[in-house]
């Protein structure tokens, strides 16, 4: 978790002279109570936004937007904490807007926005905005939280990000498989413009069942540069076990941006269609 | 091929506890968290909680939280799933699934039946 | 706890036609809906979630819309094997929850 490296953060608005600081996620007010605190965040709602470095690259970002609550707790609301929390790994990011001056009831409800959150694809995550000071123990929270999650580098606009691009997003192997003769399967698919292997892993299933009856590992030596973008042919011999039938194949490219982590490329191929009754073989062909 | 294997039937008394495994193959075990659903005879999924499969750390539905405990075992790529004080009304299918948010592999369930 | 409700209970519907299932949340959750389809026996199978992105295998023919409150799952054409229940799932509120249930039957 980061923040976009982006020109100085702000938080102020007519109105409101405030200030972004990075951010310990244990706020003061967590060791010194106050005894008068502000109400909760109000319609907190987390979006996918996408944001460009000062580099120029393309960062998919957790666009965080919520209001106040019309109540007269904003003349002690002196801040905010935000909080961004990766769900699996329980990393946490916090920056905190600093109010340096006293909110007053206006004409309109006030509205924050905070958009420098850099987040990974087809991650999970959980947003958290504490209005300050934080309430005392046993006291209302004041707090709001909603989960987020990213779209993987198959989604039109991630597919562009920079991160996405790292990991062969770009790259449309347009996986054909097809079966042939004496138990073999031809798998054909198209080269990425970089001298890289590949590996292509096999593996089939029983019709109905997800646990396989066979496994295989091809490996593809890095192709020449004449050949990028051509398309390369493999038969794969499979092992002759009776309704050992549905065949899933995956390519796995070992690009240098991305190494053993790449993004995966998948067909499969299903059993052939049983017909439910078998239809008897007439013992006379009609002439009609 | 993503796979979530689960432990086999239990039968339980009235105030026993219940363990589940699910173990887990075909990704990194420790890229994605394990959420645990229960679902009782002829009734609607329940959501149980998760745990993160990194760090270990859990977050239980309210009316679970107490008498749950989830954990895991990275060197085996296995989640397990413990449930105490075992009820009547406990009697379940009791699903493990890959992820905390969006649950994109399910295991294949495992029933627990609670009766003295 | 966000409170999601499915109507209706039960849907019959003939092969061929289409079906449209209902998912209600007790507040706003964007775009944070998963759909999933469980036939007797098994375990559920993931459909459709957030940007209205269909899991890895799921067909055409089933398509989700709507965010905020009001959610919808289409299945423009059914298929025998598409008589199911399917169940909605918000994951916007830390605590999940799903919907009772949409059984989709044989008219």
């Known amino acids: 978790l980061r923040l976009l490296d982006h020109r100085a953060l702000v938080c102020s608005q007519p109105g409101l002279n405030c200030t972004v600081k990075n951010s310990t996620c244990l706020d003061d007010s967590w060791i010194h109570p106050r005894n008068l605190t502000p109400s909760s965040p109000k319609d907190l709602q987390i979006q996918l936004h996408f944001a460009h470095t000062q580099q120029g690259d393309l960062f998919p970002v957790a666009h965080i937007e919520w209001t106040l609550q019309t109540d007269a707790s904003i003349l002690y609301l002196e801040g905010a904490e935000l909080s961004v929390l990766q769900l699996n790994t329980n990393e946490r990011l916090c920056v905190r807007f600093e109010f340096l001056s006293k909110l007053r009831h206006h004409h309109r409800r006030w509205r924050f926005t905070f958009s420098h959150f850099v987040v990974d694809p087809d991650q999970e995550y959980e947003v958290t905005v504490h209005h300050l000071p934080k309430p005392i123990p046993d006291g209302d929270p004041n707090h709001q939280s909603k989960n987020f999650l990213v779209p993987d580098c198959e989604h039109a606009r991630m597919k562009v990000t920079t991160p996405c691009m790292s990991s062969g997003s770009l790259w449309d192997p347009n996986i054909t498989v097809e079966t042939l003769e004496a138990h073999q399967l031809r798998v054909s698919f198209t080269l990425w413009n970089e001298s890289t292997h590949y590996q292509i892993l096999l593996t089939s299933f029983p019709h109905m069942e997800n646990h396989s009856c066979f496994e295989h590992m091809h490996h593809i030596p890095a192709p020449r540069p004449e050949e990028f973008h051509q398309r390369s042919n493999v038969t794969l011999t499979l092992r002759n076990l009776k309704g050992c039938c549905r065949h899933q194949v995956q390519i796995q490219p070992f690009f240098s941006s991305c190494l053993n982590d790449c993004l995966r490329h998948s067909a499969t191929v299903s059993c052939p269609e049983m017909p439910d009754t078998p239809e008897p073989i007439p013992d006379y062909m009609p002439l009609w | 091929q993503v796979q979530l294997v689960q432990s086999g039937a239990e039968v339980k008394k009235p105030g026993a506890s219940v363990k589940v495994s699910c173990k887990a193959s075909?990704?990194?075990?420790?890229?994605?968290?394990i959420s645990w659903v229960r679902q009782a005879p002829g009734q609607g999924l329940e959501w149980m909680g998760w745990i993160s499969t990194y760090s270990g750390n859990t977050n239980y539905a309210k009316q679970f939280k107490g008498r749950v405990t989830m954990t895991t075992d990275t060197s085996t790529s296995t989640a397990y799933m413990e449930l105490r004080s075992l009820r009547s009304d406990d009697t379940a299918v009791y699903y493990c699934a890959r992820r905390v948010l969006r649950l994109d592999y399910w295991g294949q369930g495992t029933l627990v039946t609670v009766s003295s | 706890e966000i409170v999601m409700t499915q109507s209706p209970a039960t849907l019959s519907v003939s092969p061929g036609e289409r079906a449209t299932l209902s998912c209600r949340a007790s507040?706003?959750?964007?775009?944070?809906l998963g759909w999933f389809q469980q036939k007797p026996g098994q375990a559920p199978r993931p459909l459709i979630y957030g940007w209205n992105t269909r899991a890895t295998g799921v067909p055409a023919r089933f398509s989700g819309s709507g965010s905020g409150t009001d959610f919808t799952l289409t299945i423009s054409s059914l298929q025998s094997e598409d008589f199911a229940v399917y169940y909605c799932q918000q994951y916007s509120d830390p605590f999940l929850t799903f919907g009772g249930g949409t059984k989709v039957e044989i008219k």
């Open positions: 507040q706003d959750i964007s775009i944070s």
């Open positions: 075909g990704y990194s075990f420790t890229r994605y968290g």
